[in-house]
């Protein structure tokens, strides 16, 4: 069954945590659907964003952070492992120095920590996708 | 009650027709939600687009056409009558020489015909909005 989009969930992250998302683009890549995942510092959507991950399907991925309301230096990748009309599994793992983004089991993007992941209080998944799974796994102590 | 998004409906347009859309942005303008309305030449989403209307809420509106698979010259407007978190009523009227776009009863954008409106077979409304009304009215002969 489908989860509502935008999908918002409270989350606490630290080294070893993984956010897993399963979904599917809602339009053909010719029409440039988007997927966005934002790690927020508060439960409010206007809050700062520790890790912003935006896919323009068929075009590019941009990653960034929003600090004190201002977007910082954007990181762009042309790597496009997502396929038109096909389900994807996206997992974002918190490593000691960076986020590692896996697409369908393959390491596809990385983003160095700018703000400590412990600052994250909420994850939002949204834009032009249907969403079937959202999970945050925590490292067993 | 809400209509599904993306929302697709078969439509025939000519001078005097009006497409009316009521909806609401799904995110605060700080996060740049989009609204897109596309007038297609076929029932397929990959088909050419006679009139492409895309709002990046809080930022800009772009209008264009997609002919033989290729995007043409984009028309951009910074006019932003939409309000953060508020319902909007959008009406697109087919005039003899252009489309006239009204937002909440105010004439806000125009786009000269590049392809005759009679070529339209389908309208799609999508991206980051909830949709409560979609209507195509035809001029009484």
């Amino acid at each position: 069954s489908l989860l509502p989009v935008p999908y918002t969930e409270a989350a606490s992250l630290s080294t070893g945590s993984t956010v897993t998302i399963k979904g599917r683009p809602l339009a053909c890549f010719l029409n440039e659907p988007y997927l966005q995942v934002d790690f927020h510092t508060e439960m409010k959507e206007e809050s700062d964003i520790v890790f912003h991950f935006q896919v323009c399907f068929g075009r590019r991925v941009v990653m960034n952070s929003r600090e004190y309301g201002a977007w910082k230096q954007q990181v762009e990748s042309k790597n496009m492992p997502f396929q038109d009309g096909q389900e994807f599994e996206l997992s974002i793992s918190v490593l000691p120095d960076k986020y590692q983004v896996m697409v369908n089991g393959q390491s596809s993007y990385t983003f160095d920590h700018r703000i400590k992941p412990e600052a994250v209080k909420m994850v939002q998944v949204w834009r032009d996708i249907s969403l079937t799974k959202f999970n945050v796994s925590y490292l067993k102590r | 009650s809400l209509l599904p998004v993306p929302y697709t409906e078969a439509a025939s347009l000519s001078t005097g027709s009006t497409v009316t859309i009521k909806g609401r942005p799904l995110a605060c303008f700080l996060n740049e939600p989009y609204l897109q309305v596309d007038f297609h030449t076929e029932m397929k989403e990959e088909s050419d687009i006679v009139f492409h209307f895309q709002v990046c809420f809080g930022r800009r509106v772009v209008m264009n056409s997609r002919e033989y698979g290729a995007w043409k010259q984009q028309v951009e407007s910074k006019n932003m009558p939409f309000q953060d978190g508020q319902e909007f009523e959008l009406s697109i009227s087919v005039l003899p020489d252009k489309y006239q776009v009204m937002v909440n009863g105010q004439s806000s954008y125009t786009f000269d015909h590049r392809i005759k409106p009679e070529a339209v077979k389908m309208v799609q409304v999508w991206r980051d909005i909830s949709l409560t009304k979609f209507n195509v009215s035809y001029l009484k002969r």
Epitope: C28, F29, L30, E32, C56, F57, G58, R59, R60, K78, N79, M80, F82, Q83, D84, G85, Q86 | E46, R66, Y68, G69, A70
Partner: nanobody
Framework: ELQVVESGGGLVQAGDSLRLSCAVS????????MMWFRQAPGKEREFVAA???????YCANSVKGRCTISRDNAKDTVYLQMNSLKPEDTAVYFC???????????????WGKGTLVTVSS
Amino acid sequence: ELQVVESGGGLVQAGDSLRLSCAVSGRTFSSYHMMWFRQAPGKEREFVAAIAWRGGTYCANSVKGRCTISRDNAKDTVYLQMNSLKPEDTAVYFCAASLRYVFDPSAMDYWGKGTLVTVSS
């Protein structure tokens, strides 16, 4: 209708580089996603690389780190650069066009006839 014609194949030494070209004729080239596949003798056709209409790219694991795919929409041409070639890269290389960005040969709309690449050790 699109016509697809590959060129640039030939005999090369292991460790060398090669650039394959794919010329496409048809006014809708810019809206097609372009793919390279290859077929070794007696094997299935396999995906090598893709470039979306808007420039996103992907290379298969078998060529990752050795492959660059690019397109020039003004020249209606797609390029596949292959570095550090190995004997197992020997195959007929096919260029294909699709309205869907997928890595599945059955989803392609148009195919070229292929160009043979032979890598000798």
